[in-house]
């Protein structure tokens, strides 16, 4: 366990031309505050992905009013450090996002308005217990100067805060096999409490007898690098020999979310959905009021002025969560039908419909039979996102408006001649054939093949096809 500490030194215009306008004015005085978000590893995740190592808000800075005509100076900053406590081992490599927020103090409807002024991000290596590291980051025309460090909380020590220290039992030296705890020379490394054989580099423990692995290591003693190759069986072969990950306790087992938060598993870890009034990785931060600026991404805070009354964040379109901390992938719900494509325009969703479809969700088939008449006795048949007319004899075309030549398809078999007729077509059959389409041969004995000729109709007579 330990604390990541961030000290903001200055925030103001960067060097070079194109100095930014002051964010505050005589009409709109404002003050700054900062938010830091930490993630383990050298991730390049989007700004809205969870701050898995933790997040913190600064206090508000002094109220600032721009002096007319004066260039934007370094802006007055909040007092104190931003502190992000971490419960587990310090990962050594981490990503950070530092946001500079402006709180406008003019006559805002519904209280102060917040807007994001600048966001910087980076990926760094840092050993716990080391000196302050200084950094300069630029965001557009703004420049942010800051220092940071990670320090272990007693009794933890070491570059990952995984070794434990205890006060000396004897005044002069540590017990057998135990070293002094630099830099706390009056303390000794605690007797080994982890499981016997637990890797000192890749494992750590918080309870006696356990061995928990740092990212990238597995096995009962954290001595096996995690293999990226697939395992041979659903659970994989023996994890102790191959490094395949064996499903163990889920990250939500035992519910790590405090204060009534609900836990959901993510591909890498877990995510807590916190009740109002609480936030942080494990919903551990409480007593929050609107004065703390708990609503991210431009959310509007409404509610209590004292820690006991809950606040409500009214999130802008595209964000959700009790603190507006989660970006909503509204299109992932597949709202558009019939092949329409979903566009998230921020303020609204829109379905871009394919030809032939309309409606907010492309649910209306413009080519369906509703209100579509097929002419000349044709009947409408729906299918495949389009309509077609099944036309009465003698008519064709999309709407059965065109007169069809019934003989165009050469319907009379065996050399029969086709004649167009007002009610269809007539086949004049060649000798030896009969039937509506001259399809039946006449047998030499005068009997015809099936079907029998209708009464009064001699073989060879023209057959009318009705």
């Amino acid at each position: 366990a330990g604390v990541f500490e961030l000290q903001i030194h200055s925030f103001g215009p960067g060097p070079g031309p194109g100095a930014p306008r002051s964010p505050c004015s005589a009409r709109l005085p404002c003050r700054l505050f900062f938010r830091v978000c930490l993630k383990p590893g050298l991730s390049e995740e989007a700004a809205e992905s969870p701050c898995a190592l933790g997040a913190a808000l600064s206090a508000r800075g002094p109220v600032y009013t721009e002096q007319p005509g004066a260039p934007a100076p370094d802006l007055p900053l909040p007092d104190g450090l931003l502190q992000v406590p971490f419960r587990d081992a310090w990962p050594g490599t981490f990503s950070f996002i530092i946001e500079t927020w402006r709180e406008e103090l003019g006559d805002q409807i519904g209280g102060p308005a917040w807007s994001l002024l600048a966001r910087v991000a980076g990926r760094r290596r840092l050993a716990a217990g080391g000196p302050w590291a200084r950094d300069i980051q630029r965001a557009g025309a703004w420049e942010l100067r800051f220092s940071y460090r990670a320090r272990c909380e007693p009794p933890a020590v070491g570059t990952a805060c995984t070794r434990l220290c205890r006060p000396r039992s004897a005044p002069s030296r540590c017990g057998p096999g135990l070293r002094p705890c630099a830099p706390l020379e009056d303390e000794c490394e605690a007797p080994l409490v982890c499981r016997a054989g637990c890797s000192p580099e890749h494992g750590f423990c918080e309870q006696p007898g356990e061995c928990r692995c740092l990212e990238g290591w597995t096995g009962p003693l954290c001595t096996v690098p995690v293999s990226t190759s697939s395992c041979l069986s659903p659970r994989g072969p023996s994890s102790a020999t191959t490094g395949c990950l064996v499903p163990g306790p889920g990250p939500c087992d035992g519910n790590p979310c405090a204060n009534g938060g609900s836990c959901s598993e993510t591909p890498r870890s877990f995510e807590c959905t916190c009740p109002r009034g609480f936030y942080g990785l494990r919903c551990e931060v409480s007593g929050v009021t609107c004065a703390d600026g708990p609503c991210f991404n431009g959310g509007l805070c409404v509610g209590g002025a004292d820690p006991d009354s809950a606040y409500i964040c009214h999130c802008p379109p595209g964000f959700q969560g009790s603190n507006c901390e989660k970006r909503v992938d509204r299109c992932s719900l597949q709202p558009c039908r019939n092949g329409g494509l979903c566009l998230d325009l921020g303020h609204a969703l829109r379905c871009r419909c394919r030809a032939g479809f309309a409606g907010p969700r492309c649910e209306h088939d413009l080519d369906d039979c509703a209100g579509r008449a097929c002419a000349n006795g044709g009947t409408c048949v729906e299918g495949g996102g389009a309509h077609r007319c099944s036309c009465a004899l003698g008519f064709g075309g999309r709407d059965c408006r065109e007169r069809a030549d019934p003989c165009a398809a050469r319907p009379c078999a065996h050399g029969g001649r086709c004649y167009a007729h007002f009610s269809g077509l007539v086949c004049a059959c060649a000798p030896g054939y009969m039937g509506a389409r001259c399809e039946f041969p006449v047998h030499p004995d005068g009997a015809s093949a099936l079907p029998a000729a209708p009464p009064g109709l001699r073989p060879g007579d023209p057959q009318r096809y009705l």
Epitope: D329, R330, C331, S332, Q334, C336, G339, G340, L341, C342, L343, D344, L345, G346, L349, R352, R354, A355
Partner: antibody
């Protein structure tokens, strides 16, 4: 991460058919949120969208109006790839051909992943 | 013939702010989100801005986009030498039922 690997000939004779393939790794041609495009670029015509295929319960295609009569884009689910066929080629079709993904949820028009490009010359 | 019109070139000194315009019509920019691409010499284009003003992960916040009516613009603040490239706008066109790209703008860092 998502990658697109193009393959196909660099030289095609006039009146023949161009066939290019784009193999997808790290995503699926039957993804419910992505669209898969072919785009070409030439000095005379600049960047030109040719068409796309995408899956939303079933596969759909759309093509640039100017090419509708001679273009086909086909997805191949079994090989996780999609292909371009352009027939009746003329020297005007000489260009660098790119396959791309529109993979940002809610922004299918943003082509976030591009193949390496294939220089296609139409000449006898 | 591209449906979206851009100036052929723009330039600035390091640290300066450069703006590129993109002009279209009601059927494209007027009714659809605009996207911007950067193409460094000899490489495929890269998505720089999507949905008018959204930056994909990894794109520096020196790049910003905006849209008004049937025009859009891309701003590069604090110009750097590595920004020297061709920049293209693009949007869906409802009347053509397809994507249209801009004519392209070559940005030179002096």
């Amino acid at each position: 991460q998502v990658q697109l690997q193009q393959s196909g000939p660099g030289l095609v004779k006039p009146s023949q058919t161009l066939s290019l393939t784009c193999a997808i790794s790290g995503d699926s041609v039957s993804s419910n949120s992505a669209v898969w495009n072919w785009i070409r670029q030439s000095p005379s015509r600049g960047l030109e969208w040719l068409g796309w295929t995408y899956y939303r319960s079933k596969y759909y295609n759309d093509y640039a109006v100017s090419l509708k009569s001679r273009i086909t884009i086909n997805p191949d689910t079994s090989k996780n790839q999609f292909s371009l066929q352009l027939n009746s080629l003329t020297p005007e079709d000489t260009a660098v051909y790119y396959c791309t993904r529109g993979g940002i949820v809610g922004a299918p028009d943003g082509f976030d992943i591009w193949g390496q490009g294939t220089m296609v010359t139409v000449s006898s | 013939q591209s449906a979206l019109t851009q100036p052929p070139s723009a330039s600035g000194t390091p640290g300066q702010r450069v703006t590129i315009s993109c002009s279209g019509s009601n059927s494209n920019i007027g009714s659809n989100p605009i996207n911007w691409y950067q193409q460094l010499p000899g490489t495929a284009p890269k998505l720089l801005i999507y949905s008018n003003n959204q930056r994909p992960s990894g794109v520096p916040d020196r790049f910003s986009g905006s849209k008004s009516g049937t025009s859009a613009s891309l701003a590069i603040s604090g110009l750097q030498s590595e920004d020297e490239a061709d920049y293209y706008c693009a949007a869906w066109d409802d009347s053509l039922n397809g994507h249209v790209f801009g004519t392209g703008t070559k940005v030179t860092v002096l």
